[in-house]
Interface confidence: low
């Protein structure tokens, strides 16, 4: 169970994990107090016969994919949480772990 | 520019929009004060040669897809906002339109 890591200079065409910083302010999600931005990563590339595991997306996660239309078939298969400071429904500021916010591994579904 | 609408009883195998209610509390996104749940819809199905337009995901959007692994290739091509009560980075409770929260149309990328 593995996945490729790439960067913007990579020539890899297969499904790969790329670095991406999500800026909550830019996306309009400004009820998040902290962090204002974080390294989320994203998946992009061609899907052939590898990376068959698909991570079940059970949370709101960012899908910004600057590498184009191949992205949606190449999806996260392992994700991890980040600690966030946010506002809860009881009008309290909460510090907690929000699951499935960082892409650790990519694969094809 | 069009898309298919299906429901849980549908025999359609192609990329289609299905009804789905997102429950923010269940997903742990409890800094959203209201609504606690809303009709988000989702995309699922096989992608052949139709529905070529891909919606550019520029916001954190829910990707829960109970119909399985075909989902990521079949993505929203038109989305609309919902009004939400939420907490912003200036520590104010805001009533605002959050974009790209409801799937109006599905297509293949």
């Amino acid at each position: 169970d593995f996945g490729l890591d790439c960067d913007e200079h990579s020539t890899e065409s297969r499904c790969c994990r790329y670095p991406l910083t999500v800026d909550f302010e830019a996306f309009g999600w400004d009820w998040i107090i902290a962090p204002k931005r974080y390294k989320a990563n994203y998946c992009s590339g061609e899907c052939e016969f590898v990376f068959l595991q698909k991570y079940p997306h059970t949370h709101l996660v960012h899908q910004a994919n600057p590498r184009g239309s191949a992205g949606p078939c190449c999806t996260p298969t392992k994700m991890s949480p980040i600690n966030m400071l946010y506002f809860n429904g009881k009008e309290q500021i909460i510090y907690g772990k929000i699951p499935a916010m960082v892409v650790d591994r990519c694969g094809c579904s | 520019d069009f898309g298919l609408d299906c429901d849980e009883h549908s025999t359609e195998s192609r990329c289609c929009r299905y009804p789905l209610t997102v429950d923010f509390e269940a997903f742990g996104w409890d800094w959203i004060i209201a609504p606690k749940r809303y009709k988000a819809n989702y995309c699922s199905g096989e992608c052949e040669f139709v529905f070529l337009q891909k919606y550019p995901h520029t916001h954190l959007v829910h990707q829960a897809n109970p119909r399985g692994s075909a989902g990521p290739c079949c993505t929203p091509t038109k989305m609309s906002p919902i009004n939400m009560l939420y907490f912003n980075g200036k520590e104010q409770i805001i009533y605002g339109k959050i974009p790209a929260m409801v799937v109006d149309r599905c297509g293949c990328s």
């Epitope: 009008e91 | 009560l85 104010q92 009533y95």
Partner: antibody, heavy 124, light 107 residues
Framework: QVQLVQSGAEVKKPGASVKVSCKAS????????MHWVRQAPGQGLEWIGN????????NYNQRFKARATLTTDTSTSTAYMELRSLRSDDTAVYYC?????????????????WGQGTLVTVSS | DIQMTQSPSSLSASVGDRVTITCKAS??????LSWFQQKPGKAPKSLIY???RLVDGVPSKFSGSGSGQDYTLTISSLQPEDFATYYC?????????FGQGTKLEIK
Amino acid sequence: QVQLVQSGAEVKKPGASVKVSCKASGYSFTGYFMHWVRQAPGQGLEWIGNIYPYNGVSNYNQRFKARATLTTDTSTSTAYMELRSLRSDDTAVYYCARRYYYGTGPADWYYDVWGQGTLVTVSS
Amino acid sequence: DIQMTQSPSSLSASVGDRVTITCKASQDINSYLSWFQQKPGKAPKSLIYRANRLVDGVPSKFSGSGSGQDYTLTISSLQPEDFATYYCLQSDEFPLTFGQGTKLEIK
């Protein structure tokens, strides 16, 4: 029962400051936003701002931002509205009001409890 | 700031009458509108929130409607205790802004 009791009437000279108090009882003070609204004699209602006692965060109407300060004392469950550099047109009844969140939709709140009002008269 | 224009500014009516007060916003306020009743020397009392939802304990003779920029408060059958001044409030945007009020008097 939930109650907001405000301080008594004040008479101030132009240029002075006034600090109106609003003592809450019958509920968890830190969990609800407190709003301040004023009403000049024979006039309409004007929103001054609000404060969240849990963390002291406040929001102001820009018209009052330079002169008004909203604070809270959680140990006594009291909210305060201070207005500086008073002018004759600040003569008004000042109200505190609790924002009650009903919790079923994006703007489901209303002012469910008001203080009795504090008349501030500014006169030379 | 969003301007709220209430009309009429005063209104004479008789017991049993049905009356309508309107409030127009300077922009779309997404139904984030409340209505208040105020009697002389008293604090305002909330009647309606979110344009058409009745506050707990408020009689059903009060109703609200509208969307976008235009909203109305209707009192279906006036009783002596209903003669008062009524205000609208928009909560779509800070600063919150009130209408100038409608004084409802006995004819």
